[in-house]
C-alpha cells in the first residue's frame, strides 16, 4: 500500500561537499526490514545514488564504495551524502520500502533539492 514519506524541500551542501537530510516515513505497520534508496532526478533521468536495507534497531549498511552514510531512529532515517560537486546539484528523492513482514509498503518522498557550490580555490600566498 502507499506510505507517506517526508523530507526537507531544500538543503545546501557544506563547502566540503557534504549534504545531510532526514527522511521520515509514516509506517502503517511494524516493519522489521526496511529498504531505503536515494534517487537523483534530473529532467526525465532518474539514477540510483545509493541504497541500504536494514533491520529495525540496527545501523544502515551501505556498500563500501557508497557516497552515502546513514543512521536510523524509529521511523526516521538520517542520510548523509558525501563527495558532492556543483554538477551534482539536483533533486534527491527518498524511497522507502517496508520489505518484511508483509504487507509490502512503498513510499516516495517529494524530493530534496540539494544545492552544491564548489568552493573557490584558495589564492596562492606569497
Amino acid at each position: 500500500k502507499a506510505m507517506h514519506v517526508a523530507q526537507p524541500a531544500v538543503v545546501l551542501a557544506s563547502s566540503r561537499g557534504i549534504a545531510s537530510f532526514v527522511c521520515e516515513y509514516a509506517s502503517p505497520g511494524k516493519a522489521t526490514e526496511v529498504r531505503v534508496t536515494v534517487l537523483r532526478q534530473a529532467d526525465s533521468q532518474v539514477t540510483e545514488v545509493c541504497a541500504a536495507t536494514y533491520m529495525m534497531g540496527n545501523e544502515l549498511t551501505f556498500l563500501d564504495d557508497s557516497i552515502c552514510t546513514g543512521t536510523s531512529s524509529g521511523n526516521q532515517v538520517n542520510l548523509t551524502i558525501q563527495g558532492l560537486r556543483a554538477m551534482d546539484t539536483g533533486l534527491y528523492i527518498c524511497k522507502v520500502e517496508l520489505m518484511y513482514p508483509p504487507p509490502y509498503y512503498l513510499g516516495i518522498g517529494n524530493g530534496t533539492q540539494i544545492y552544491v557550490i564548489d568552493p573557490e580555490p584558495c589564492p596562492d600566498s606569497d
Epitope: K1, T37, L39, Y104, L106
Partner: nanobody
C-alpha cells in the same frame, strides 16, 4: 521535454476492438513503466494496465483481464493497448502515463498490481483519447 501522445480512440460497437497507441518522446522507454488509465464522466481515474519496459512485466485491472493486452515497441518508443470484447462500461477517456522504474517497487510484483495501477505513482501524463462503446 517529456511528452506522451495517445491515439486510436473512437466509437466502436459492443464486442468490438480497438488499439490505442501511446507515443513517448523526451525519454526512452527502456527504463520506464507506462500505464494506461481511464476516466468515465463523474468517476475517478482508474488504472487499466501497465508495462514495465525494462523486463516486460505486465499488470492488469481485474475488470479488463483477458480482454485487454498491453505491449510495447521500444524501437518506436510506443506502447499499445489492445482492447477486445469491448463493453459499454469501457466508455471513457483513456490516458497513458509514465514513471521511471526506479520509483516503483524494487522487486517486481511486490504489492501486486497496486503501485503499477495507481495514478499517484506516475509523473508524466498524456492528454487522453476518447473511447466510446455504443450500438
Amino acid at each position: 521535454e517529456v511528452q506522451l501522445v495517445e491515439s486510436g480512440g473512437g466509437l466502436v460497437q459492443p464486442g468490438g476492438s480497438l488499439r490505442l497507441s501511446c507515443a513517448a518522446s523526451g525519454f526512452t522507454l527502456d527504463y520506464y513503466a507506462i500505464g494506461w488509465f481511464r476516466q468515465a464522466p463523474g468517476k475517478e481515474r482508474e488504472g487499466v494496465s501497465c508495462i514495465v519496459s525494462s523486463d516486460g512485466s505486465t499488470y492488469y485491472a481485474d475488470s479488463v483481464k483477458s480482454r485487454f493486452t498491453i505491449s510495447r515497441d521500444n524501437a518506436k518508443n510506443t506502447v499499445y493497448l489492445h482492447m477486445n470484447s469491448l463493453k459499454p462500461e469501457d466508455t471513457a477517456v483513456y490516458y497513458c502515463a509514465a514513471v521511471h522504474g526506479l520509483k516503483l517497487p524494487t522487486l517486481r510484483g511486490l504489492g501486486g498490481s497496486y503501485y503499477y495501477l495507481q495514478a499517484r505513482s506516475y509523473d508524466y501524463w498524456g492528454q487522453g483519447t476518447q473511447v466510446t462503446v455504443s450500438s
